[in-house]
């Protein structure tokens, strides 16, 4: 029919029906990072609390070694936040003589490891230029976004420095995921 | 079995059930905020519009003074936009002498307070040096997470500065939760 | 009951049960952008990809012509990320003689286009001045937050400047939305 | 400071009511929770029920559901505790206190005695 | 409702000794607070979510424990501790204090 532009909707009895109290759901805190090796042109991924104060892991979604697993295939919502913190970056000598005026820069990235395929996908970035003029700074990157995903895929959060990563505080730094 | 690293996910008709649209939901949006008391070493909680334009409440999720009610027990998808502006910060008078170089800071807490807990919680922290050279500075920060939150808990935004708080515009600060 | 405060929640059985697999969902990553007429005072809208990569629309949520369609009515939890990057902006030359000391800006509004009201409403804005002092900058602004919204209606974001959006990788510009 | 001041002592009559006061100074009431917790003579402390003031929802021990009404007024920072039909193993201290916000702050306590 | 049985009933010690006071649930909770009570006056609280020490509470006092059985302990006595103490569970509704345990100077 002209301008029916969308199939009806009213037949809604869809199965598999289940209780959304069932479903995969992770939110993990920041806890202080120990110096691991990471390859080189490849960021460090942290590692987070899973049981303690507001971290949580439930319905078969785990957490080890920096990933979490993911349990069952579907269409997962990713978020995290890393605050940053550090001292005056280089470029804010303003324009001084003889170093490069180039920015640092912080960079938080969600990566998805997974079977079927042979290297890591990155599914979110944040990415941002310092050029801050004051001694020190501190500031946070959040991305969150959803995702199909399968049985078996892995998650992890890199960043460009983990020295930078504030660790203080479980509000301020956190990586989540859970089932639609 | 060898490899069998995740229980089996086909068995999905759990209970109870309930439909979607009946979960508690709320989407607040930011107000004029008139000057209130508040105690020393707290930072202020922002009030909010619960009704009016793209604000509402529904499914027995209610706002009073500053809280957003927590009607039943669940994990709940919690999340902020606090938009500051202001003038040049202190620190932008690059390394004047006499100065303290230290920079300014805008934060926004999402703040739980819980009957089961002695103080209250800070669940979601976004917090930034602002150290700007422009006469007036303007910048979101977001914040969103996942939490499980029990029946008659009470969630409130607090800024470090109410006075920097954007409240001309419902789109550029905000709070909601919804029950997953 | 007396002391009763929230309506009882055991009784969990409601309808219409749908499953949640069969939810409109839609994840749009970054194109490069064509020019394109864009009216005064209006932001330019980005068009995105829908299909390849990461992105996908499913369950009657469809792309097209930098829109997504709303195909029912419901509460849906919509985000975005955009990723801009530019060079030094007027600003920085720090209080420079004959030069207005206006900082520049980024902008993002995710916007909603419905039958029922004559002209686009704007859901979520971020917007952030950009004085930067190094040569290149560029930062991410990100928006997400749940709206009720009508079958029929339509979504797009719009930028202040599309020349500065960051088109270079799927996973720093993005767009989506799905029904709670 | 933070303090609650109660009101002062109560003796009643089997079957009556008794309605005391616990008025909230240093803090916004609606910010906390705000209790009653009992403690007959030489016995052990009991707690009764919870208001919280920003929305007047209340949470009662069963024991005390169909006897007890906890109640507030924001304006002048004061929370209520009415217990109705008092028998004399009502006779005790009544104390509020308070959740949600540390400093733990608890009232002097209210001598309620209840005596044909 | 969650029972909380603490033991000893009372605990006869000598200043600068060590106390130890335990609270055993019915059934698992999450956090458990004690109060220190004397003579007259309102409890007072010592340690909040198992384990954490209330403003102006000596670091002679701490308190473990987790599910069903936390501790409370003193690690020196000093002449103002001896009193009533009381566990209390804010897992379940209702909240349940236990019967206490009174410290006397042996």
């Known amino acids: 029919l002209k301008g029916q532009e969308f199939a009806p909707s009213h037949q809604q009895v869809y199965a598999p029906l289940r209780a959304d109290g069932d479903k995969p759901r992770a939110h993990l805190t920041v806890v202080r990072q120990t110096p691991t090796q990471h390859f080189k042109n490849q960021f460090p991924a942290l590692h987070w609390e899973h049981e303690l104060g507001l971290a949580f892991t439930k319905n078969r979604m785990n957490y080890t070694n920096k990933f979490l697993l993911i349990p069952e295939s579907g269409d997962y919502f990713i978020y995290s936040q890393v605050t940053f913190r550090g001292m005056t970056s280089e470029c804010s000598e303003i324009r001084q003589a003889g170093r490069p005026n180039k920015p640092d820069s912080i960079t938080v990235v969600i990566t998805k490891v997974t079977d079927s395929y042979p290297e890591p996908t990155q599914l979110l970035m944040g990415t941002k230029s310092v050029c801050e003029v004051g001694s020190n700074w501190f500031q946070p990157i959040y991305l969150g976004a959803m995702f199909s995903l399968q049985e078996g895929d892995k998650l992890m959060v890199n960043v460009s420095d983990i020295s930078l990563v504030d660790y203080t505080k479980e509000d301020k730094t956190f990586f989540g995921a859970f089932l639609l | 079995l060898k490899g069998q690293e995740f229980a089996p996910s086909h068995q999905q008709v759990y209970a109870p059930l309930r439909a979607d649209g009946d979960k508690p939901r709320a989407h607040l949006t930011v107000v004029r905020q008139t000057p209130t008391q508040h105690f020393k070493n707290q930072f202020p909680a922002l009030h909010w519009e619960h009704e009016l334009g793209l604000a509402f409440t529904k499914n027995r999720m209610n706002y009073t003074n500053k809280f957003l009610l927590i009607p039943e027990s669940g994990d709940y998808f919690i999340y902020s936009q606090v938009t500051f502006r202001g003038m040049t910060s202190e620190c932008s008078e690059i390394r004047q002498a006499g100065r303290p170089n230290k920079p300014d800071s805008i934060t926004v807490v999402i703040t739980k307070v819980t009957d089961s807990y002695p103080e209250p919680t800070q669940l979601l922290m976004g917090t930034k040096s602002v150290c700007e050279v422009g006469s007036n500075w303007f910048q979101p920060i977001y914040l969103g997470a996942m939490f499980s939150l029990q029946e008659g808990d009470k969630l409130m935004v607090n800024v470090s500065d109410i006075s920097l708080v954007d409240y001309t515009k419902e789109d550029k600060t905000f709070f909601g939760a919804f029950l997953l | 009951l007396k002391g009763q405060e929230f309506a009882p929640s055991h009784q969990q059985v409601y309808a219409p049960l749908r499953a949640d697999g069969d939810k409109p969902r839609a994840h749009l990553t970054v194109v490069r952008q064509t020019p394109t007429q864009h009216f005064k005072n209006q932001f330019p809208a980005l068009h995105w990809e829908h299909e390849l990569g990461l992105a996908f629309t499913k369950n009657r949520m469809n792309y097209t012509n930098k829109f997504l369609l709303i195909p029912e009515s419901g509460d849906y939890f919509i985000y975005s990320q955009v990723t801009f990057r530019g060079m030094t902006s007027e600003c920085s030359e720090i209080r420079q003689a004959g030069r207005p000391n206006k900082p520049d800006s980024i902008t993002v509004v995710i916007t909603k286009v419905t039958d029922s009201y004559p002209e686009p409403t704007q859901l979520l804005m971020g917007t952030k001045s950009v004085c930067e002092v190094g040569s290149n900058w560029f930062q991410p602004i990100y928006l997400g937050a749940m709206f009720s919204l009508q079958e029929g209606d339509k979504l797009m974001v719009n930028v202040s400047d599309i020349s500065l959006v960051d088109y270079t990788k799927e996973d720093k510009t993005f767009f989506g939305a799905f029904l709670l | 400071q933070v303090q609650l001041v109660q009101s002062g002592a109560e003796v009643k009559k089997p079957g009556a009511s008794v309605k005391l006061s616990c008025k909230a100074s240093?803090?916004?009431?609606?910010?906390?929770?705000m209790h009653w917790v009992r403690q007959a003579p030489g016995q052990g402390l009991e707690w009764m029920g919870r208001?919280?003031?920003?929305?007047?929802?209340?949470k009662y021990d069963p024991k005390f559901q169909v006897r007890v009404t906890m109640t507030r007024d924001t304006s002048t920072s004061t929370v209520y505790m009415e217990l109705s039909s008092l028998r004399s193993e009502d006779t005790a201290v009544y104390y509020c206190?308070?959740?949600?916000?540390?400093?733990?702050?608890w009232g002097q306590g209210t001598t309620v005695t209840v005596s044909s | 409702e969650i029972v909380l049985t603490q033991s000893p009933g009372t605990l006869s010690l000598s200043p600068g000794e060590r106390a130890t006071l335990s609270c055993r649930a019915s059934?698992?909770?999450?956090?458990m607070y004690w109060y220190q009570q004397k003579p007259g006056q309102a409890p007072r609280l010592l340690i909040y979510a198992t384990s954490n020490l209330a403003s102006g509470i000596p670091d002679r006092f701490s308190g473990s424990g987790s599910g069903t059985d936390f501790t409370l302990t003193i690690s020196r006595l000093e002449p103002e501790d001896f009193a009533v103490y009381y566990c209390?569970?804010?897992?379940?509704?209702?909240?349940?204090f236990g019967g206490g345990t009174k410290l006397e100077i042996k």
């Open positions: 209390q569970q804010w897992s379940g509704n209702p909240r349940t």
């Open positions: 240093g803090f916004d009431i609606q910010d906390t929770y």
């Open positions: 206190s308070r959740s949600g916000g540390l400093p733990d702050v």
């Open positions: 059934s698992s909770v999450s956090y």
């Open positions: 208001i919280d003031p920003a929305s007047g929802h209340t």
